[in-house]
Amino acid sequence: MSRSNRQKEYKCGDLVFAKMKGYPHWPARIDEMPEAAVKSTANKYQVFFFGTHETAFLGPKDLFPYEESKEKFGKPNKRKGFSEGLWEIENNPTVKASGYQSSQKKSCVEEPEPEPEAAEGDGDKKGNAEGSSDEEGKLVIDEPAKEKNEKGALKRRAGDLLEDSPKRPKEAENPEGEEKEAATLEVERPLPMEVEKNSTPSEPGSGRGPPQEEEEEEDEEEEATKEDAEAPGIRDHESL
């Protein structure tokens, strides 16, 4: 990817891959333009992450146009929520987090949702975003999925998501499905500066952990190990 791309200006609804430290380039949507009046977010776009439904403020250097970058960044990744994000950016690009509320910042203009997009094909797949989400969840650390010898163990695909035997005990879940798992497995860490903390928990994560791959960028490996193979706000759903 050329450096010049990093200075690109984006508009509401643009589909991108967004880069946060410790995470792979993630399918995302520009939900708000930079607010010059607010120093902390000047020159930063509010980005909605597909799959996890988290938001963060990122500068243009951390954003990459989706269509141009999907060959490079759109490969399966072990992070929970990533694969579902790839589906959403293609098929449901205007998806909003549950409990969506319009932000009072400079948010995108609401327009009618398009028909479902083709999964593959001729290019203009950009949906018009329908505002930004105030709903964000805390970042959590969870244990990575264990490799297994059985066939398809690394292919956590629809129809093969539930384990036959539990890997660890699970407590009762709350009505919206945000599981509270064993305390030792849910260790909170400070939120990155750009991520807005909000009391509403995030949506459940992807139903499939894709084939495990090494991170593309070497400088992330240590961070990824510390932070674990999870996306923001996502918990392991392979524990059944």
């Epitope: 490969k75 399966p76 694969s83 579902e84 790839l86 589906w87 959403e88 098929n91 549950s98 479902p116 083709a118 999964a119 593959e120 094909g121 398809g152 292919k155 956590r156 695909r157 629809a158 129809g159 093969d160 998501l161 539930l162 699970k170 919206e176 499905g177 599981e179 949506e203 459940p204 992807s206 139903g207 499939r208 894709p210 759903h237 524990s239 059944l240």
Partner: antibody, heavy 120, light 104 residues
């Protein structure tokens, strides 16, 4: 635009083998993450999943029908074929094919369905 | 096999009503649940995926919730075009549909 269309006989006799073809466009079964499933629906009854084939030839079958079902794909023709042996009148149903991603999301795109009647 | 049980099997409602359809799985399906709408003579349409996420083009009066084994689909204000049969479907272990709820 994604489209799927089922084709095959409308009438089969008991004990015969049913062969149905799903011809699709707008996606490729050589693309990572893509699958095609067959679902059927007897008249006035519920949907029943039959089989799924993934881009990497990893297949899944309904356990109660597994011994009678075979699902195959011809990537170059954009087709998926389902064969069902030893047909019985209770197999009379509308048979649908649908596209699925392994990204753990639903059957977002369906064919129009084809009604297959099993009768002597 | 995971069994899916919907209730009620059929229900009558008036336009503008708030309608809720329930779906129970025979084991915890960890939110791996979709909802479909089917009108007579037509193929089903995906409404909600992963328990609560609205599929593209689906009106916001539809919503889904639940966890563990119990899930529900709610139509906040019933419209004429919502008259159909609704199916839940789990995809945690293979795929299984509920028996359907006919909305009249």
């Amino acid at each position: 635009q994604i489209t799927l269309k089922e084709s095959g006989p409308t009438l089969v006799k008991p004990t015969q083998t049913l062969t149905l073809t799903c011809t699709f466009s707008g996606f490729s079964l050589s693309t990572s993450g893509i699958g095609v499933a067959w679902i059927r629906q007897p008249p006035g009854k519920a949907l029943e999943w039959l089989a799924t084939i993934w881009w990497d030839d990893d297949n899944r079958y309904n356990p109660s029908l597994k011994s009678r079902l075979t699902i195959t794909k011809d990537t170059s023709k954009n087709q998926v074929v389902l064969t069902m042996t030893n047909m019985d009148p209770v197999d009379t149903a509308t048979y649908y094919c649908a596209q699925i991603y392994d990204y753990a999301v639903g059957f977002a795109y369906w064919g129009q369905g084809t009604l297959v009647t099993v009768s002597s | 096999d995971i069994q899916m049980t919907q209730s009620p099997s059929s229900l009558s409602a008036s336009l503008g009503d708030r309608v809720t359809i329930s779906c129970r799985a025979s084991q915890d399906i960890s939110n791996y649940l979709n909802w479909y709408q089917q009108k007579p003579g037509k193929a089903p349409k995906l409404l909600i995926y992963y328990t609560s996420r609205l599929h593209s083009g689906v009106p916001s009066r539809f919503s889904g919730s639940g966890s563990g084994t119990d899930y529900s689909l709610t139509i906040s204000s019933l419209q004429p075009e919502d008259i159909a049969t609704y199916y839940c479907q789990q995809y945690g272990k293979l795929w299984t549909f509920g028996q359907g709820t006919k909305l009249e």
